[in-house]
């Protein structure tokens, strides 16, 4: 018996085609993806093979201004127009906290949403109780498939499920509901799920039971093959795993933002053993047409957003300076906005020994592109924060040794005075560069704030200790020559998009008046510093 | 072999009752979900009730509401339906399904989600 499973992750609110690197798409005939595109094919395949699963391993949530609008709404709406049979929950299903998830999608989805290790307690049991499912028996064709979810244990530092859902061990919380679907002759079983290819690999050598995992989360691209775009790939397509019980275990991902739809056929025996698999994800470009009644509705939804992007979300009493002159220079006020910004947006209070998880911020000079004029009524707009931040990347949360942080902050330096983009705006740190030594040793002073403090204060940067910092994704995947924060990070989870975290920040403080305030020091003759 | 198999349907007058049965064989009605579907000639597949396995809760259908009731004998691995005041539009072909995913018995009857066990189907006809 051959089935079909068609899926996606990480598609992050795009719902509009977008460009080959998944932002903004400008010329419509190179332009990828998207949920018109994204349904002629899976119809396509739908009408030529008879066992076909359309699914989805969360974060569908968050990413454009889809998402800032419409809240989750659009995800419920063109998900179910395309007919998808299952979902699991991804760690951005909780940005708009528990109700943000349950009265947008959970009650309007008209498929499963899946996750076996979150456990609602309190008040909210009752309240969500059947609206998401550990798992999902599925009829397809004359057989029948379980579906069993998982979701990040780092959900509660990456997100706002507050403090009625418990996320467990995933192959602890898996392991049961598997076997139960086994003790009701479920015998084909797929873990769908949210927690990275490395987390994806060990539920499938360590779950009993399961036949096939389907994972996100860590924009894993797999291939076989010539690949067809700019993707590496991490491996073949799909990859095996083999069991600590002696299967072969197939595990897929399709990378992120709806540019490609995973393509995986599996044959099982009458058993409900694997005995083959193969597929690629296919890479869904101009050459697929975009659905017509798809992309009609589309164009309908699209109305509101133009709306929003004009109206005010708060006002500036004081010049946001973003300037290349001052931001690729020394400390400008933009750059301290974007990263207080940051760091609010990261307040998780998860643990009385810390008075937040993180509180420190870096942010490359080069990826502010544009100032903000207080002298227009002070009003701040999408569109304003859009030209300040014209990318569509994302504020992600890694954590990197003090030593790594050092060598950051040394090439921040390494070439001052030419204008280019690496030069480091900081938040939650006090810098002091010397500027007649040689590059690569200029950084003379480094303090950061603690977290595990209840009064907040400034110390010396430890090379040994593990810091968490928020930064963009462009910095965490070694942009602007930043190769050792990519090459030595210990863990990186994607996050918000980045004119949404700023723009919710000035709506919530209404009015802001950013200053330049000392963070960054630099001069350029030789002070008697105690080198650290 | 899985299966689930209708029996109980047939003609009534109005106003009279039937008691439809399901029972199951290749697995235990205890751990599933079960609903009684219902289809009329020319209309869309209804729920009418649904019943959990776990703590028995039930649902019904607005329109059948104080006349039908369902419950399960887990030692027969049987479902009933006891249909009472039958009216002319109650006639159609009866399904009887099962899920042993732990959804809802309302998301069960809605159907919110597609469900994986079916019956053939038992006709019950109600006419003078």
């Known amino acids: 018996w051959e089935l079909t499973i068609l899926h996606t992750n990480d598609v992050h609110s795009r719902l509009e085609q977008t460009s080959e690197d998944s932002s903004k798409c400008v010329n419509a005939s190179r332009c990828m993806g998207g949920v018109a595109r994204l349904f002629t094919k899976v119809q396509q395949i739908r009408r030529a093979e008879p066992n076909v699963l359309l699914l989805d391993a969360g974060d569908q949530y968050q990413g454009t201004i889809w998402f800032t609008v419409y809240k989750g709404a659009e995800v419920a709406h063109f998900m179910n127009a395309l007919r998808y049979d299952a979902m699991a929950l991804g760690n951005h299903e909780f940005d708009n906290g528990v109700e943000g998830l349950i009265e947008p999608l959970l009650k309007e989805a008209k498929f499963p949403i899946l996750s076996a290790n979150i456990k609602a307690k309190g008040p909210l049991a009752s309240q969500i109780s059947g609206l998401y499912l550990p798992y999902k028996v599925l009829p397809v064709g004359d057989e029948v498939v379980g579906i069993v979810g998982y979701t990040s244990k780092e959900t509660p530092f990456l997100s706002n499920p507050g403090t009625n859902l418990v996320f467990e061990d995933e192959i602890t919380a898996l392991q049961p509901e598997v076997d139960k679907l086994k003790t009701l002759n479920v015998n084909k079983i797929i873990a769908l799920g949210h927690s990275g290819f490395e987390m994806d690999k060990l539920i499938a050598q360590k779950v009993r039971g399961v036949d096939v995992v389907v994972g996100g989360h860590s924009n894993t691209f797999l291939y076989t093959g010539n690949p067809p775009s700019k993707e590496v790939p991490a491996g073949k397509y799909p990859f095996i795993v083999t069991s600590d019980d002696g299967r072969k275990v197939p595990v897929v991902q399709a990378y992120a933002f709806g540019k490609y739809l995973g393509y995986l056929k599996i044959e099982f025996d009458e058993r409900g053993n694997v005995i083959s698999s193969h597929g690629n994800p296919i890479l869904l470009n101009s050459s697929i047409p975009e659905d017509p009644s798809i992309k009609a509705d589309i164009n309908k939804w699209r109305i509101k957003l133009d709306n929003y992007s004009t109206q005010e979300l708060g006002k500036t009493i004081v010049y946001l300076d973003g300037s290349s002159q001052s931001c690729r220079f020394r400390e400008c006020n933009m750059g301290n906005l974007i990263c207080d910004a940051m760091i609010n947006n990261n307040l998780r209070h998860t643990d009385e020994m810390f008075w937040n998880h993180v509180s420190m911020c870096i942010l490359n000079g080069g990826g502010i592109r544009s100032p903000i004029d207080e002298r227009n009524n002070g009003t701040i707009t999408w569109e304003n924060l859009a030209a300040v931040l014209p990318f569509g990347g994302t504020f992600d949360l890694v954590q990197l040794k003090g030593s790594t942080l050092k060598k950051a902050f040394e090439h921040s330096v390494h070439r001052y005075g030419q204008s280019t983009g690496e030069f480091l705006q900081v938040g939650g740190i006090h810098v002091v560069y010397d500027l007649s030594r040689k590059p690569g040793d200029r950084v003379v002073k480094l303090d950061v704030l603690c977290t595990k403090c209840r009064v907040p204060s400034y110390d010396p940067l430890k090379m040994d200790e593990v810091y968490k910092v928020i930064l963009p994704n462009f910095l965490a995947n070694g942009g602007d020559g930043f190769q050792m924060i990519k090459d030595e990070l210990l863990r990186h989870d994607s996050g918000d998009q980045d004119i949404n975290v700023v723009s919710t920040y000035i709506s919530k403080m209404k009015v802001i008046y950013p200053a330049v305030e000392g963070r960054i020091k630099a001069h350029h003759h030789h002070h008697h510093h105690h080198h650290h | 072999q899985r299966q689930l198999v209708e029996s109980g349907g047939g003609l009534v007058q109005p106003g009279g009752s039937l008691r439809l049965s399901c029972a199951a064989s290749?697995?235990?009605?205890?751990?599933?979900?079960i609903g009684w579907f219902r289809q009329a000639p020319g209309k869309e597949r209804e729920g009418v009730s649904c019943?959990?396995?776990?703590?028995?809760?039930?649902y019904y259908a607005d329109s059948v509401k104080g006349r039908f009731t369902i419950s399960r004998d887990n030692s027969k691995n049987t479902v009933y339906l006891q249909m009472g005041s039958l009216r002319a539009e109650d006639t159609a072909v009866y399904y009887c399904?099962?899920?042993?995913?732990?959804?809802?018995?309302?998301?069960?009857?809605?159907?919110?989600?597609?469900?994986?066990?079916w019956g053939q189907g038992t006709l019950v006809t109600v006419s003078s």
């Open positions: 290749g697995f235990l009605l205890d751990y599933y979900v």
């Open positions: 019943i959990s396995g776990s703590d028995r809760s039930t």
């Open positions: 399904a099962a899920d042993p995913s732990p959804v809802t018995v309302q998301a069960m009857c809605l159907p919110r989600f597609p469900v994986p066990y």
